[in-house]
């Protein structure tokens, strides 16, 4: 499956913190959507294969990283001056 | 920062085993990416020979896939390079070579290089 | 394996000229995922290559924006705006779209 970590995370302002998500489903490609109140998904970043990965709508204020298949950080950067949401990680093959 | 480096003999005989080891440091090579061995023949010419994955998993170039193995020990942050049956084309300049973070597979951190020169 | 051809194979050049290579593939470097995996090195000699232009068009951290990269499919170029003496090196266009990654044979930046 696909397991996304923590749950509920708070951060103290000026701070970086990263969301986990890893699969063992062998899928190449992985996402990072956003979800605010009322809105509809929108797409952070993207991975389609190890050590490659694109921006999409959304991505300043976040970072990621792909240094292996089952995993794909995303990590929320100080400069995001407005956090709060509904994050959602996803994969396919 | 990744650094690497490469160590082994100079001369090899022909047709004996040609041995190399690439130590890593700055970054666990089980922790991801892909850890190259790329050669540089004397008239210039770059050939990727292949790499060992952070899982352990092998990509060879199939030019070479009946003579070379690439392998690991991870307790010493090593990855090493097993050419067989070499011949004086083998003599070349060896890299250990990795990607740079988020480029796809282009790689931009390499070992100083060494010669391995295949003479009786 | 996928053959990369470079033109020209040598070139004389002053400081301050524009200067294009090109590098042609025997087959399309476009992925199964889109992205055309096509690299720019530069070597300078006695030392391992260092990454100029990754994924056809993007500059490596550090890179002058002198340099620019270009092309789609089988068709690439890496061109220097105005050359700098630091320039005069030999560059190698790289893919890793397909297994075996192949180099191009290179082209030598020579001063004038």
């Known amino acids: 499956g696909i397991t996304q970590s923590p749950k509920y995370l708070f951060r103290k302002e000026g701070q970086n913190v990263t969301l986990s998500c890893e699969q063992n489903l062998n899928h190449d490609a992985m996402y990072w959507y956003r979800q605010d109140p009322g809105q509809g998904l929108r797409l952070i970043y993207y991975s389609q294969i190890v050590n490659d990965f694109q921006k999409g709508d959304i991505a300043e204020g976040y970072s990621v990283s792909r240094e292996k298949k089952e995993s794909f950080p995303l990590t929320v950067t100080s400069a995001q001056k407005n956090p709060t949401a509904f994050y959602l990680c996803a994969s396919s093959i | 920062q990744v650094q690497l480096q490469e160590s082994g003999p100079g001369l090899v005989k022909p047709s004996e085993t040609l041995s190399l080891t690439c130590t890593v440091s700055?970054?666990?090579?089980?922790?991801?990416?892909?850890w190259n061995w790329i050669r540089q023949f004397p008239g210039k010419g770059l050939e990727w020979m292949g790499y060992i994955s952070y899982d352990g998993s092998n990509n060879y170039n199939p030019s070479l896939k009946s003579r070379i193995t690439i392998s690991r020990d991870t307790s010493k942050n090593q990855f090493s390079l097993k050419l067989s049956s070499v011949t004086a084309a083998d003599t070349a300049v060896y890299y250990c070579?990795?990607?740079?973070?988020?480029?796809?597979?282009?790689?931009?951190?390499w070992g100083q290089g060494t010669t391995v020169t295949v003479s009786s | 394996d996928i053959q990369m051809t470079q033109s020209p194979s040598s070139l004389s050049a002053s400081v301050g000229d524009r200067v294009t290579i090109t590098c042609r593939s025997s087959q399309s470097l476009v992925h199964s995922n889109r992205n055309t995996y096509l690299h720019w090195y530069q070597q300078k000699p006695g030392k391992a290559p260092k990454l100029l232009i990754y994924k056809v068009s993007n500059r490596f951290s550090g890179v002058p924006s002198r340099f620019s990269g270009s092309g789609s499919g089988t068709d690439f170029t890496l061109t220097i705006s105005s050359l700098q003496p630091e320039d005069f090196a030999t560059y190698y266009c790289?893919?890793?779209?397909?297994?075996?990654?192949?180099f191009g044979q290179g082209t030598k930046l020579e001063i004038k």
């Open positions: 070579a990795s990607p740079s973070p988020g480029t796809g597979y282009a790689v931009d951190y």
């Open positions: 700055g970054y666990s090579i089980t922790s991801g990416y892909f």
């Open positions: 790289s893919q890793s779209t397909h297994v075996p990654f192949t």
